[in-house]
Interface confidence: medium
Amino acid sequence: CSCAPTHPQTAFCNSDLVIRAKFMGSPEIIETTLYQRYEIKMTKMLKGFDAVGNATGFRFAYTPAMESLCGYVHKSQNRSEEFLIAGRLRNGNLHITACSFLVPWHNLSPAQQKAFVKTYSAGCGVCTVFPCSAIPCKLESDSHCLWTDQILMGSEKGYQSDHFACLPRNPDLCTWQYLGVSMTRSLPLAKAEA
């Protein structure tokens, strides 16, 4: 499955549900359907309180049974390892794919962990992380922040991804803001053309 690079903030904002959870074993194929499901143990919900309503947790994560249809394959055998899972809600069930933002929680930078818990939500529906995959690229709106990690770092895992969020500076302007102790520092040339 070929997946477009995604900034963690985009993954957070575009998902119905973001949770921390542990995978409890091998997938269970659901006969005659397109899906299989992993048993999971949710440890914390980071987004989706409104959508979920009274549900206290999710026992399963559903994914296409065929890898060819972007089914997620969980490779870790460690049941105590906690993962960040950003997925979709479908008829009350959590759905994930090979393209879902799904990473071990300890692999996230401290700034990303903090942002998933409290910061990214401030940019949802207001600001847009705009990927710059080839030069020249240019911002289409003041509500966009130019994401240049792929060009500057050759990877989607770069400085902006690890340490910055695209947040409203004022009602008409979004800028990269540092996810350190202070939320006032901006990335230089954040609004410039790359």
């Epitope: 005659t32 397109l34 296409p64 008829n91």
Partner: antibody, heavy 120, light 108 residues
Framework: QVQLVESGGGLVQPGGSLRLSCAAS????????MSWVRQAPGKGLEWVSA????????YYADSVKGRFTISRDNSKNTLYLQMNSLRAEDTAVYYC?????????????WGQGTLVTVSS | DIVLTQPPSVSGAPGQRVTISCSGS????????VSWYQQLPGTAPKLLIY???QRPSGVPDRFSGSKSGTSASLAITGLQSEDEADYYC?????????FGGGTKLTVL
């Protein structure tokens, strides 16, 4: 916005061949499984074939298995359907459709279709 | 072959409520989601309902879907002349995507 544009339809004799194309734009083509669905004149929709995002896996309806081949060129954002040993009952409008990446049991976007007529 | 069964036609007067049924089996509707597509005359099909009862953005709430066991249905309330179209149900059945034969809705 998502756009799917089919081409390559036309009149062909029974036993002949035809290749349909579907040019895709407005989304990351290689991330989506794609499909062909056809509709005979005055009839209903019939699923024909599907292909994974990478092109490594293909699926066919029994009615076309062994005669039709689905393929894709992700560098050109194009889906293809090679139709061989055509029969009169293959006469239909052929639609290119995108399978939703999270829920690949449904078709979320469709092209306008291209007409294939098999007749002598 | 047509795997899902729909009535060939239904009709109703403007403002009325009509329902279109879709009958399948345990291997398709019984264990999978149902989608509905609207095909206006001379145009391509358009996704109308997915996940049995969910509407994509832009689809009026006059359209609603439901599923029970191995059957599904589409309901249209406050019928309007622009609803005159063909409607198809669709599901999944063991590595195959399956459609109903279609129902022509006539607004009287």
């Amino acid at each position: 916005q998502v756009q799917l544009v089919e081409s390559g339809g036309g009149l062909v004799q029974p036993g002949g061949s035809l290749r349909l194309s579907c040019a895709a734009s407005g989304f990351t083509f290689s991330s989506y499984a794609m499909s062909w669905v056809r509709q005979a004149p005055g009839k209903g929709l019939e699923w024909v074939s599907a292909i994974s995002g990478s092109g490594g896996s293909t699926y066919y309806a029994d009615s076309v298995k062994g005669r039709f081949t689905i393929s894709r060129d992700n560098s050109k954002n194009t889906l293809y359907l090679q139709m061989n040993s055509l029969r009169a009952e293959d006469t239909a409008v052929y639609y290119c459709a995108r399978l939703d990446t999270y829920y690949p049991d449904l078709f979320d976007y469709w092209g306008q279709g291209t007409l294939v007529t098999v007749s002598s | 072959d047509i795997v899902l069964t729909q009535p060939p036609s239904v009709s109703g007067a403007p403002g009325q409520r009509v329902t279109i049924s879709c009958s399948g089996s345990s291997s398709n509707i019984g264990s999978n989601y149902v989608s509905w597509y609207q095909q206006l005359p001379g145009t391509a099909p358009k996704l109308l309902i997915y996940d049995n009862n969910q509407r994509p953005s832009g689809v009026p709430d006059r359209f609603s879907g439901s599923k029970s066991g191995t059957s599904a249905s589409l309901a249209i309330t406050g019928l309007q002349s622009e609803d005159e179209a063909d409607y198809y149900c669709q599901s999944y059945d063991q590595r195959k995507w399956v459609f109903g034969g279609g129902t022509k809705l006539t607004v009287l």
